[in-house]
């Protein structure tokens, strides 16, 4: 759920207070500790392989 006063994000994205915009939940695979990932429906399905 969005914080009051923030624009709703489309499906597959979540609001980033740090960046002040909607961010892709898909990016949580590479950066799972991003604060907006808490707003994504599911945990990233696989670790980012280096």
């Amino acid at each position: 759920e969005q914080a009051p006063g923030t624009a709703p994000c489309s499906r597959g994205s979540s609001w980033s207070a740090d960046l002040d915009k909607c961010m892709d939940c898909a990016s949580c695979r590479a950066r799972p500790h991003s604060e907006f990932c808490l707003g994504c429906a599911a945990a990233p399905p696989a670790p980012f392989r280096l």
């Epitope: 892709d24 990016s27 950066r31 399905p45 980012f48 280096l50």
Partner: antibody
Framework: EVKLQQSGGGLVQPGGSMKLSCVAS????????MNWVRQSPEQGLEWIAE??????????HYAESVKGRFTISRDDSKNSVYLQMNNLRPEDTGIYYC??????????WGQGTTLTVSS | DTVLTQSPASLVVSLGQRATISCRAS??????????IHWYQQKPGQPPKFLIK???NRDSGVPARFSGSGSGTDFTLNIHPVEEDDTAIYYC?????????FGAGTKLELQ
């Protein structure tokens, strides 16, 4: 408006050195992974280096073709990223772009700067 | 490294017709939720311009004429109807692992 302004490049002899710079504006620089991508007729678009975030002690990654010769660095206080290139080879000739990505795709690119390695 | 193979290398399409560009990965670049393939457009003398992320999501400002699809190893960029301004080289890129690699590009020309 996001802008990545590049400087550096030019003609250098084989074995020589060159430093490229890129100054960013219009986005929260310190949150983004910064990259260098080069382009040549022979190799096409080739990712060559990435530097990540201060929170992780600025980890870096390099393409095998430049490992040990190129060094990427950044200065978040100046919104800048750099590429120090040593022991340059003719095959390093190309257009060099700085590009940013949060995690996956390169959403903004610099205008490009040309490096020619030739005697 | 994950190799991306684009086809065709070049494509000539009439105004208003459909252009279809393929990108095949040497291994799967998809999870159950997302595909880690992205598309770019490059015009002469310019840097690549980001078009589509995660196989099918257009960047803001990219016309709906551009669409992406696919999962696993096979991905497609469609442009329909093609306009004159679409003359360019199109590249796919993966972000499955380090190094992120690009396809060799597909040159789109108008008849």
């Amino acid at each position: 408006e996001v802008k990545l302004q590049q400087s550096g490049g030019g003609l250098v002899q084989p074995g020589g050195s060159m430093k490229l710079s890129c100054v960013a504006s219009g986005f929260t620089f310190s949150y983004y992974w910064m990259n260098w991508v080069r382009q040549s007729p022979e190799q096409g678009l080739e990712w060559i280096a990435e530097i990540r975030l201060q929170s992780n002690d600025y980890p870096t990654h390099y393409a095998e073709s430049v490992k040990g010769r190129f060094t990427i660095s950044r200065d978040d206080s100046k919104n800048s990223v750099y590429l120090q290139m040593n022991n340059l080879r003719p095959e390093d000739t190309g257009i060099y772009y700085c590009a940013c990505r949060y995690a996956d795709y390169f959403d903004h690119w610099g205008q490009g700067t040309t490096l020619t390695v030739s005697s | 490294d994950t190799v991306l193979t684009q086809s065709p290398a070049s494509l000539v399409v009439s105004l208003g017709q459909r252009a279809t560009i393929s990108c095949r990965a040497s291994q799967s670049v998809s999870t159950s939720d997302y595909s880690y393939i992205h598309w770019y457009q490059q015009k002469p003398g310019q840097p690549p311009k980001f078009l589509i992320k995660y196989a099918s999501n257009r960047d803001s400002g990219v016309p709906a004429r551009f669409s992406g699809s696919g999962s696993g190893t096979d991905f497609t960029l469609n442009i329909h109807p093609v306009e004159e301004d679409d003359t360019a080289i199109y590249y796919c890129q993966h972000s499955w692992e380090i190094p992120p690699t690009f396809g060799a590009g597909t040159k789109l020309e108008l008849q």
